[in-house]
């Protein structure tokens, strides 16, 4: 297992409809063809995975179906989006890269973006 | 080295609207979010709301909603925070600093002072 | 919103003492984003301690932060005189990003 750099912003506030875009970029060492990302939370000590999607170069991202995220390559980076998020989601989102195909294996893991997730403010009773 | 530099000092008339500049450098600015700080004459500090570099979406705090709004300039790494409808009370030292994820508010601006009189 | 309060709201000591201050919130966030900032008079607030209890670049290690949940504390182990000042907590983990009203140190 050989180390590779991933770099992602440090910091992103979600929009009021609780979604999230972050690039993820790596430095690819090799001409690799298979490449699997997956997206870490980081909360209070505890990692959990978001999502994961492994694609081939020049292809799409395909995520599961009931996934939150969904995602676009373009050469060494990754357009990452997670939907559906709550103020509760708020915490540090980890970019992991596996160069799987061809050897040798190389993983990269970013510092982590932190994505702040506002609940909408609850609209005011009207009297219609 | 990384650091925040505001604009120079403001006397505005009640009413009045006034904008404040931050200019960043050291860093790469759309990877972190600039927040805004304003601190009373003799009082403590009090946290307005915060823009993300990185897609522009922002958080204001509540008792400003309406009056106050956060920009960035990307080209020209530089955030502004604009505060309408001025009153005496929102005389204060203005402060701009790096909002930086789980290393919290890390680089602070100089300051700015606005003063509001009639 | 999570309000924070700080006490004692001023403290008195001499050089060479220690120096222990409380910052509670009123509700536990994620209570590994609080930070403290110290404060001289005419200049900008200084980040001292991030995530309760780690130390920003170039600060002594003299300070150091504490505690978890609802109960933070940053002790200060040996005064040295450019340490009067005043020092906020702050929360970060949830908007809005709320300080504490600070308490100061000042020379006894």
């Known amino acids: 297992c050989k180390a590779m750099h991933v770099a992602q912003p440090a910091v992103v506030l979600a929009s009021s409809r609780g979604i999230a875009s972050f690039v993820c970029e790596y430095a690819s060492p090799g001409k690799a063809t298979e490449v699997r990302v997956t997206v870490l939370r980081q909360a209070d000590s505890q990692v959990t995975e978001v999502c994961a999607a492994t694609y081939m170069m020049g292809n799409e991202l395909t995520f599961l179906d009931d996934s939150i995220c969904t995602g676009t390559s373009s050469g060494n980076q990754v357009n990452l989006t997670i939907q559906g998020l709550r103020a509760m989601d708020t915490g540090l989102y980890i970019c992991k890269v596996e160069l799987m195909y061809p050897p040798p294996y190389y993983l990269g893991i970013g510092n982590g973006t932190q994505i702040y997730v506002i609940d909408p403010e609850p609209c005011p009773d009207s009297d219609f | 080295q990384v650091q925040l530099v505001q604009s120079g000092a403001e006397v505005k008339k009640p009413g009045a609207s006034v904008k404040v500049s931050c200019k960043a450098s050291?860093?790469?600015?759309?990877?972190?979010?600039i927040s805004w700080v304003r601190q009373a004459p003799g009082q403590g500090l009090e946290w307005m709301g915060w823009?993300?570099?990185?897609?522009?979406?922002?958080n204001y705090a509540q008792k400003l909603q309406g009056r106050v709004t956060m920009t960035t300039d990307t080209s020209t790494s530089t955030a502004y925070m604009e505060l309408r409808s001025l009153r005496s009370d929102d005389t204060a030292v203005y402060y701009c600093?790096?909002?930086?994820?789980?290393?919290?508010?890390?680089?602070w601006g100089q300051g700015t002072m606005v003063t509001v009189s009639s | 919103e999570i309000v924070l309060t700080q006490s004692p709201g001023t403290l008195s000591l001499s050089p060479g003492e220690r120096a222990t201050l409380s910052c509670r919130a009123s509700?536990?966030?994620?209570?590994?984003?609080l930070a403290w900032y110290q404060q001289k008079p005419g200049q900008a607030p200084r980040l001292l301690i991030y995530?309760?209890?780690s130390r920003a670049t170039g600060i002594p290690d003299r300070f150091s932060g504490s505690g978890s949940g609802t109960d933070f504390t940053l002790t200060i182990s040996r005064l040295e005189p450019e340490d009067f000042a005043v020092y906020y907590c702050?929360?970060?983990?949830?908007?809005?990003?709320?300080f504490g009203p600070g308490t100061k140190v000042d020379i006894k």
């Open positions: 600093a790096r909002v930086a994820g789980y290393d919290a508010f890390d680089i």
């Open positions: 050291g860093y790469t600015f759309t990877n972190y979010g």
């Open positions: 823009i993300s570099a990185y897609n522009g979406n922002t």
């Open positions: 509700q536990s966030g994620s209570s590994s984003y």
């Open positions: 995530g309760a209890s």
């Open positions: 702050q929360q970060y983990g949830s908007s809005p990003f709320t």
